[in-house]
């Protein structure tokens, strides 16, 4: 059904990391725009991004509103310059997204090492603790508040002279590692929700070596 | 140091909301850790209700988690347990506890190691 | 859930005497999240051991934990009066955080 001048989105696939969160779809629009809903299983339907000539639409304000929540949404299509016009049922053509829960579902941003620091055969490395888009109280939480104990960290280190790794964890953002006098070392961290059954892993964060500016080193 | 401090009604009629409160003392709330509910039946063992974070980041038992409501209140220092459609089964002591972070094997991980004194809730016509 | 399976569930013995208390679980456990608690009676939990293997502050040398995967050890080397009570491991790497049943250790 639908007009002959419109076609049905499809392709819809959700893209998230830490909660920023873009609905994409095809094709490019050709004499057509789009409208997108938005709602949770037991919520009303909220229209976002109205006709737009876009292929995403960016529906982060509405589910950092409860990011445990699951979330659908619909694509609409309209003749362009016509948007009134509906399909032969009376309906214009939509197509439905697969259902996304942020907290389960959302990728894992790249963590960074915020810092280290040797004290003596002892390094802590401490991980920041990335802001999201999620408000509690009118301030923006930490991937920490969100995740809670759900969250862990991974870190690799090893000798910049060698390259057998070692991995310790951590249920915080920081690390107390024991490490050989006078060795310089690398460090490299992962995000890791252990729970999960799907991206259950972020990327490796940028490698980050002892004797390079970002640590600081103590000889006691 | 920090002490915990459970209150509440002791007495609590079938299908109503048990409604308790842990104070926190010789602590900030937002200082990091994570607080947990725990009950103990008469005469058995332990089993955790569930924890909050001071941001509200909260896990709960799957078996209770249809009746459970943990809260946080930052500006009082307190947490809180609702558990909704009680019945003569939610009789216990009922106990509040820090879950602080302990260095292990190149981490820090939470183990609770401060406890409320425990709160005895019946729950009977 | 994972099950822990604490045996025996009475330990008779006498002041002086060695007591080794075990926890079975019933899937892997990582290490780092395994607890001992000593409870007495009218009291709330205490933490005796942390990670498997670490004595939480302020508990004596004479109380030690070992143990990995499935099978966990707590060991008092010798018991002092004040030790008569129960003991309960705790997971809490996998939600529901759970408790073993406890093994109540009793002068003979």
């Known amino acids: 059904s639908g007009t002959t001048n419109t076609v049905a989105a499809y392709n819809l696939t959700w893209k998230s990391t830490n909660f920023k969160t873009i609905l994409e779809w095809e094709p490019k629009p050709v004499n057509q725009v789009y409208t997108v809903q938005i709602s949770t299983k037991s919520g009303d339907w909220k229209s976002k991004c109205f006709y737009t000539t876009d292929t995403e639409c960016d529906l982060t304000d509405e589910i950092v509103k409860d990011v445990k929540q699951t979330y659908l949404a619909r694509v609409f299509s309209y003749p362009a310059g016509n948007v009134e016009s509906t399909g032969s049922a009376g309906e214009p053509l939509y197509e439905n997204s697969p259902e996304f829960t942020p907290y389960l579902e959302t990728n894992l941003g790249q963590p960074t090492i915020q810092s280290f620091e040797q004290v003596g055969t002892k390094v802590n490395v401490t991980v920041e603790d990335e802001r999201t888009l999620v408000r509690r109280n009118n301030t923006f939480l930490s991937l920490r508040d969100v995740f809670g104990k759900d969250l862990i960290y991974t870190l690799y280190y090893w000798k910049s002279s060698s390259s057998g790794k070692k991995t310790a964890k951590t249920n915080t953002n920081e690390f107390l590692i024991d490490v050989d006098k006078g060795e310089n070392y690398c460090f490299s961290v992962q995000a890791v929700i252990p729970s999960r059954t799907v991206n259950r892993k972020s990327t490796d964060s940028p490698v980050e070596c002892m004797g390079q500016e970002k640590g600081e080193f103590r000889e006691i | 140091q920090v002490q915990l401090q459970e209150s509440g009604p002791g007495l609590v009629k079938p299908s109503q909301t048990l409604s308790l409160t842990c104070t926190v003392s010789?602590?900030?709330?937002?200082?990091?850790?994570?607080w947990s509910w725990i009950r103990q039946h008469p005469g058995k063992g332990l089993e955790w209700i569930g924890e909050?974070?001071?941001?509200?980041?909260?896990r709960y038992n799957p078996s209770l988690k249809s009746r459970v409501t943990i809260s946080v209140d930052t500006s009082k220092n307190q947490f809180s347990l609702k558990l909704s459609s009680v019945t003569a089964a939610d009789t216990a002591v009922y106990y509040c506890?820090?879950?602080?972070?302990?260095?292990?094997?190149?981490?820090?991980?939470?183990?609770?190691?401060?406890w409320g004194k425990g709160t005895t809730v019946t729950v009977s016509s | 859930e994972i099950v822990l399976t604490q045996s025996p569930g009475t330990l008779s013995l006498s002041p002086g005497e060695r007591a080794t208390l075990s926890c079975r679980a019933s899937?892997?456990?990582?290490?780092?999240?395994l607890a001992w608690y000593q409870q007495k009676p009218g009291q709330a939990p205490r933490l005796l051991i942390y990670g498997a293997d670490s004595r939480a502050t302020g508990i004596p040398d004479r109380f030690s934990g070992s143990g990995s995967g499935t099978d966990f050890t707590l060991t008092i080397s010798r018991l002092e009066p004040e030790d008569f009570a129960v003991y309960y491991c705790?997971?809490?790497?996998?939600?529901?955080?759970?408790f073993g049943g406890g093994t109540k250790v009793e002068i003979k």
């Open positions: 705790q997971q809490d790497g996998v939600v529901p955080y759970t």
């Open positions: 909050i974070y001071y941001s509200g980041s909260t």
């Open positions: 506890a820090r879950d602080a972070p302990y260095y292990y094997g190149g981490g820090y991980y939470y183990y609770m190691d401060v």
């Open positions: 010789g602590g900030s709330i937002s200082s990091g850790q994570y």
């Open positions: 899937e892997s456990v990582d290490s780092s999240y």
